[in-house]
């Protein structure tokens, strides 16, 4: 006899885990025989797809390789034609071992921003997401939190928070880990301890001091008066991310200091800034303090001008006076570059001999300065023009540094050769007599303001600077 | 930080050349005087040679005046030692040394670790 | 030819006060010798004390003191310490004819 379609073993739900097998069973009592048809939510399952296995007359389905996707309702639909259609539907719950499907990956953060660590994993059931940072849990607080998608948020990022970390994934089929990342916290340039501002004497040594810190550690650069430092030496040396440098300097003139440090995040730089005044006590104190000693002089630029074996003296109001005399005269001889041939060499000998003054040893030892006519010898005859031109420089605050000042003695203010031959010295490099000077142009209107002495006269006509030392 | 470090130390015939060259960095090479300074195994230093800071003049122990030369490249912040006619007893390690100012003469005020010369056959 | 002469060797007790001699074997040291001075530990490269008879160099311990006595230099070691024990040169600048620069034979100093 007939008989309508019955479904004797309704569908249940199946787990099944990702890449295995799974069958749902459609067991139907009916005559005829009926036909059973399959859905997947409701959307029919073709005979011929090959991921699929229908048999035993369409009541067995088997999903041959189980797919994250295959997930869903399935039902079987059996009809004969006598009564009725029936069905019967069940779930497939694709069970799936726990994966990461967009793990974290290396971070570089600035201090006090928000950091993100990527973790989206994959399961079911859904897996539960930590983090360990180092080789112990991470726990969560105020700042830290574990999002409900698995990444991790730090607010306010701070230094301590640098460091390894990695992602767990885990439910009840099993765990994976994310690969270690590393999370860098830098920081902007920060200077812990700014230089100080000094008031020193001329030719003092004065070292300007600066500690900064950040990360990656900065590098620290001096800046005097707007411009790369030109002189100098600097000392650095960098202990636990702080870096400290000591710039030392031979002080000729005042000047502002600055010390900045600088670090690079990406493509962008931070820096920090600090700076400090040298300025220069009493300006013509060198020169009017007669403290100091006497010495062979033994440096340089005045080796041509001043006698082999001369005794000049040497100002202890400088730090290290001999340095300074002889930066004073090399800073003024380069001066002297650009003027006339005439003027020169003259010039270069008032210079040698006025800051490297030839010294009367004693009890005190005393400076012996230049008689004023041959000062005046230089000033109003060969370097007339030269002197109007500092002059007017002077006035209108031309030069780079005072240190000129203290190179140029004031003619008027020094000794007569007439009042005390033994109390001033004499130039023994003009070497000229009252018929050289006749062939030189006059350089300027006025006549000048005292007798030219007779100098030591020289075999040559002209005028020439001459190594060999002679004392009227 | 100022650092001197030489280099062209070595073994060498007596009657052979050997030319030292000692590289600065951490101050401005120009403005300083250099000198080469050295000391013999279980001796004493010994002054050998002594250059200002613009290079213009140079000055050497008598010992070695003819054989020795100093020289110094500014644009390459380098002081050098041209040693030539070696004989044994210029053996020693050779210092290069830093003047506290431009001044040839001034103190040494900062040394290198030494390159040694061993002049010997 | 004249020699820079130093005492072979000196010793000290911690805290004591000690004054090392420079001198040259004909004739006096003069500021015109700008003497300096250098301690030397064994191995070590040399380090400057003292520049142009008494200033002292940057980062020098005011222990170390630098004069002239009568005709010669002298460096003075007050309260000394157990890493004062080493090696110390004088250097004088000299002139005669030509510029030279001499170190003293060293002095070898012991902190008992």
């Known amino acids: 006899l007939p008989k309508a379609p019955v479904i004797t073993t309704p569908l249940e739900t199946v787990d099944a885990l990702v890449e295995e097998v799974a069958t749902f069973m459609c067991a139907v009592e009916s005559y005829p025989q009926p036909e059973i048809s399959w859905t997947r939510n409701k959307i029919l399952i073709k005979l011929f797809d090959t991921r699929y296995s229908i048999r035993e007359n369409g009541q067995l389905l088997t999903i041959l390789s189980v797919e994250d996707s295959d997930d869903g309702i399935y039902c079987c639909t059996a009809n004969n034609g006598v009564g009725g259609a029936v069905e019967s539907c069940g779930a497939l719950q694709v069970k799936m071992k726990p994966k990461i499907t967009r793990p974290p990956i290396n971070v570089k953060i600035i201090e006090g921003l928000k950091a993100v660590l990527p973790c989206t994993t994959m399961g079911n059931p859904k897996p539960s997401v930590s983090w360990i940072k180092g080789d112990s849990p991470l726990r969560e607080n105020s700042r830290i939190a574990v999002l409900e998608s698995g990444s991790l948020r730090i607010h306010n990022v701070q230094k301590e928070d640098a460091g390894q970390y990695r992602c767990v994934a885990k439910n009840s089929l099993g765990t994976a880990y994310s690969k270690v990342v590393k999370l860098e916290v830098e920081v902007f340039a920060r200077i812990l301890r700014a230089p100080e501002s000094h008031n020193v004497t001329f030719g003092s040594f004065v070292t300007l001091h600066c500690t900064a810190t950040g990360i990656p550690v900065p590098t620290i650069t001096w800046i005097e008066n707007g411009n790369a430092v030109s002189s100098g030496s600097i000392q650095e040396s960098v202990k636990d991310r702080v870096i400290d440098s000591r710039l030392q300097l031979f002080i000729t003139k005042p000047g502002l200091y600055t010390c900045i440090a600088t670090n690079k995040h990406g493509e962008k730089f931070s820096t920090a800034k600090a700076a400090a005044t040298i300025s220069i006590a009493e300006w013509s104190k060198p020169q009017k303090d007669n403290k100091g000693y006497c010495a062979q002089y033994r440096g340089e630029v005045c080796n041509a001008v001043l006698a082999k074996d001369a005794l000049v003296f040497l100002n202890t109001s400088y730090a290290d006076p001999e340095e300074a005399q002889e930066l004073l005269v090399h800073t003024a001889w380069n001066e002297l570059k650009v003027v006339s041939p005439v003027c020169r060499p003259a010039a270069e000998a008032l210079l040698c001999n006025h800051i490297f003054q030839e010294c009367s040893p004693g009890v005190v030892p005393t400076p012996i300065p230049i008689c004023r006519e041959y000062c005046l010898a230089v000033k109003e005859l060969f370097c007339a023009k030269e002197w109007l031109v500092m002059e007017e420089k002077t006035h209108r605050g031309l030069y780079r540094s005072e240190m000129h000042l203290l190179s140029v003695p004031e003619c008027s203010k020094l000794p007569s050769m007439h009042w005390d031959p033994t109390a001033c010295a004499r130039l023994p490099h003009l070497d000229y007599n009252k018929e050289n000077l006749k062939t030189f142009p006059p350089m300027t209107s006025s006549k000048p303001s005292v007798d030219i002495p007779n100098l030591p006269s020289s075999s040559s006509s002209s005028f020439s600077v001459s190594p060999t030392y002679s004392m009227t | 930080e100022v650092q001197l470090l030489e280099s062209g130390g070595g073994l060498v015939q007596p009657g052979g050349s050997l030319r030292l060259s000692c590289a600065a960095s951490g101050f401005t090479f120009s403005d300083y005087g250099m000198s080469w300074v050295r000391q013999a195994p279980g001796k004493g230093l010994e002054w050998v040679s002594a250059i200002p800071g613009s290079g213009g003049s140079t000055y050497y122990k008598e010992s070695v005046k003819g054989r020795f030369t100093i020289s110094r490249d500014n644009s390459k912040n380098t002081l050098y030692l041209q040693m030539n006619s070696l004989r044994a007893e210029d053996t020693a390690v050779y210092y290069c040394?830093?003047?506290?100012?431009?001044?040839?003469?001034?103190?040494?005020?900062?040394w290198g670790q030494g390159t040694l010369v061993t002049v010997s056959s | 030819q004249t020699v820079v002469t130093q005492e072979p060797s000196f010793s000290v007790s911690p805290g004591g006060t000690v004054t090392l001699t420079c001198g040259l074997s004909s004739g006096s040291v003069t500021s015109s010798n700008y003497p300096d001075w250098y301690q030397q530990t064994p191995g070590q490269a040399p380090r400057t004390l003292i520049y142009s008879t008494d200033s002292r160099h940057s980062g020098v311990p005011d222990r170390f003191s630098g004069s002239i006595l009568g005709n010669k230099a002298a460096l003075t070691i007050t309260g000394a310490q157990a890493d004062d024990e080493s090696d110390y040169y004088c250097g004088l600048y000299m002139y005669s004819g030509s510029k030279n620069y001499v170190f003293g034979g060293g002095t070898k100093l012991t902190v008992l």
């Open positions: 040394a830093k003047r506290s100012g431009r001044i040839a003469f001034g103190a040494l005020d900062a």
